[in-house]
Interface confidence: low
């Protein structure tokens, strides 16, 4: 806590300005003003305080506003935002996905720190919703965002945001999370045609169910071998060799190379070794 | 062989309530999405309800929607439907089936069981 | 909601016919469309599923065809036991929905 001392003369600031870089901390607590610092926090982050002056600042803020921040001064915080406890940003209310962005930005290049998640679960439940431009956002900041969200949250995102999900913000994502995604990515591509489909439900297979790959392999698709890796145990012990052929296309000699590994070992053990020859391959079930 | 076995039918005055259980054998019911779906007398099938693998996601037709509760115990491999509020134009029988996704077509269904709802 | 309408909802035809039931989806479903058969006092069974792929098990004398809004069932060499009620069902997207049905009769 800043002791309470008296602004000396001449040195109360009128404004927000380098100046102020010079202040000591008693001086910043003595001569600055709650109310001017909230109209002028545009400005903070264009002086290069330094960390215990921000501490100041804050301190003058979380005065002026108790209750929590006003969004017109949060779109504003900058680095200041940095100095902020999980506590102080569940009193926020953040509306605006211009203020996510900024406070975003400033964290950029870092891990998720609690702050930042604290802020997103304070934006997405004041929404109601993942909607796509937020997703946009939080997954062109954090790739992995998507797939840090639990089966139940994920629930709450549309089959539009869909859109927004690029093939590398599923990469962590596990079964119980694409089994949730997979059925909306469905539904936002219904109406594209065959190859477009499958260009964009790909990245989704993780969650698709054996009658879905069935239906893709009458489709000519030609399905790599990364992807197949990546299909549900479960819903590919299901298919026929045939099935398999057709849906891999030119792929399927990959099968070969995989043929220790899961969905592929467990799905050789399952099919007749008659079948397997059919392939060329040397499976052996 | 899967089997799926719908029991909890019966009589109920309107207002009443119902819990349908299907008991579900032969398939990993764990790797599966479930659903209802009812068939008045004489009349089409209706789908009523679904629910995710996981049973994190739950879906529901209008006209069910809070008053009806889908959920599903992968331990005992059992699916529930809890009816509430329940209605004369609810009697039908309603079948269980096992889906393959949230949104599917049903290639295994229960053989039903009855539900009437009169005074 | 999508609503399916199947022709004719009733038809009568002798064993070894050839018969065919139409399905049509109010908008487009892309081949996100199943056939089921459902006999007296009995649970319904699947035929078909992708509009066109033939469900494990079933015979095939039945074959569906068709994408987007117009969708048929065909049975090439209608059977005995093939008479029966049947129903088109789409899962494109929610709710899921049903055709009213189609009753083969024989004549």
């Known amino acids: 806590e800043v002791e309470k001392t008296a602004c000396p003369s001449g040195k109360k600031a009128r404004e927000i300005d380098e100046s102020l870089i010079f202040y000591k901390k008693w001086e910043l607590e003595a001569c600055v003003d709650a109310a001017l610092l909230a109209t002028q926090m545009d400005r903070v982050n264009a002086i290069p305080f330094t960390y215990e002056q921000l501490d100041v600042l804050k301190h003058k803020l979380d005065e002026l506003y108790p209750q929590g921040y006003p969004e017109s001064v949060i779109q504003h915080l900058g680095y200041l935002f940095l100095k902020m406890s999980p506590e102080d940003i569940r009193k926020w209310n953040v509306t605006s996905l211009e203020t996510l962005k900024a406070l975003l930005e400033v964290n950029k290049g870092h891990e998720m720190s609690p702050q930042v998640a604290t802020l997103i679960d304070r934006f997405v439940k004041g929404r109601g919703q993942l909607d796509k431009d937020t997703l946009d956002t939080l997954t062109a900041f954090y790739p992995g965002y998507l797939c840090s969200l639990s089966p139940e949250e994920l629930s709450s995102v549309p089959p539009s945001s869909i859109w927004a999900v690029r093939p590398q913000d599923l990469d962590t994502c596990d079964p119980r999370q694409l089994d949730v995604l997979y059925p909306k990515a469905r539904l936002a591509f219904q109406n594209m045609n065959g190859s477009e489909y499958f260009v964009k439900i790909q990245s989704f297979l993780g969650g698709a169910p054996t009658e879905d790959l069935k239906a893709l392999s009458q489709q000519n698709v030609s399905m790599d071998l990364a992807t197949f890796m990546k299909l549900r145990t479960d819903a590919v012990l299901p298919l026929t060799v045939a099935e398999v052929q057709k849906l891999l296309g030119p792929h399927v000699e990959g099968l070969k190379a995989e043929e220790r590994h899961r969905p592929v070992r467990d799905w050789i053990l399952r099919q007749r070794q008659d079948d397997l020859d059919t392939l060329g391959l040397g499976l052996q079930g | 062989e899967v089997q799926l076995l719908e029991s909890g039918g019966g009589l109920v005055q309107p207002g009443g309530s119902l819990r349908l259980s299907c008991a579900a054998s032969?398939?990993?019911?764990?790797?599966?999405?479930m659903t209802w779906v009812r068939q008045a007398p004489g009349k089409g099938l209706e789908w009523v309800s679904g629910?995710?693998?996981?049973?994190?996601?739950?879906y529901y037709a209008d006209v069910v929607k809070g008053r009806f509760t889908i959920s599903r115990d992968n331990s005992k491999n059992t699916l529930y439907l809890q009816m509430n509020s329940l209605r004369a134009e609810d009697t039908a029988v309603y079948y269980c089936?096992?889906?393959?996704?949230?949104?599917?077509?049903?290639?295994?269904w229960g053989q039903g069981t009855l539900v009437t709802v009169s005074s | 909601d999508i609503q399916m309408t199947q022709s004719p909802s009733s038809l009568s035809a002798s064993v070894g016919d050839r018969v065919t039931i139409t399905c049509r989806s109010s908008?487009?479903?892309?081949?996100?469309l199943a056939w089921y058969q459902q006999k007296p006092e009995k649970a319904p069974q699947s035929l078909i599923y992708?509009?066109?792929s033939l469900q494990s098990g079933v015979p095939s004398r039945f074959s569906g065809s068709g994408s987007g809004t117009d969708f048929t069932l065909t049975i090439s060499n209608l059977q005995p036991e093939d008479f029966a009620t049947y129903y088109c069902?789409?899962?494109?997207?929610?709710?899921?929905?049903f055709g009213g049905g189609t009753k083969v009769e024989i004549k």
């Open positions: 089936a096992k889906r393959g996704a949230a949104v599917g077509s049903f290639d295994y």
């Open positions: 069902q789409q899962y494109n997207s929610y709710p899921l929905t």
């Open positions: 032969g398939l990993t019911f764990r790797s599966y999405a």
């Open positions: 629910i995710s693998v996981s049973g994190g996601i739950t």
């Open positions: 908008q487009g479903i892309g081949s996100w």
């Open positions: 992708a509009a066109s």
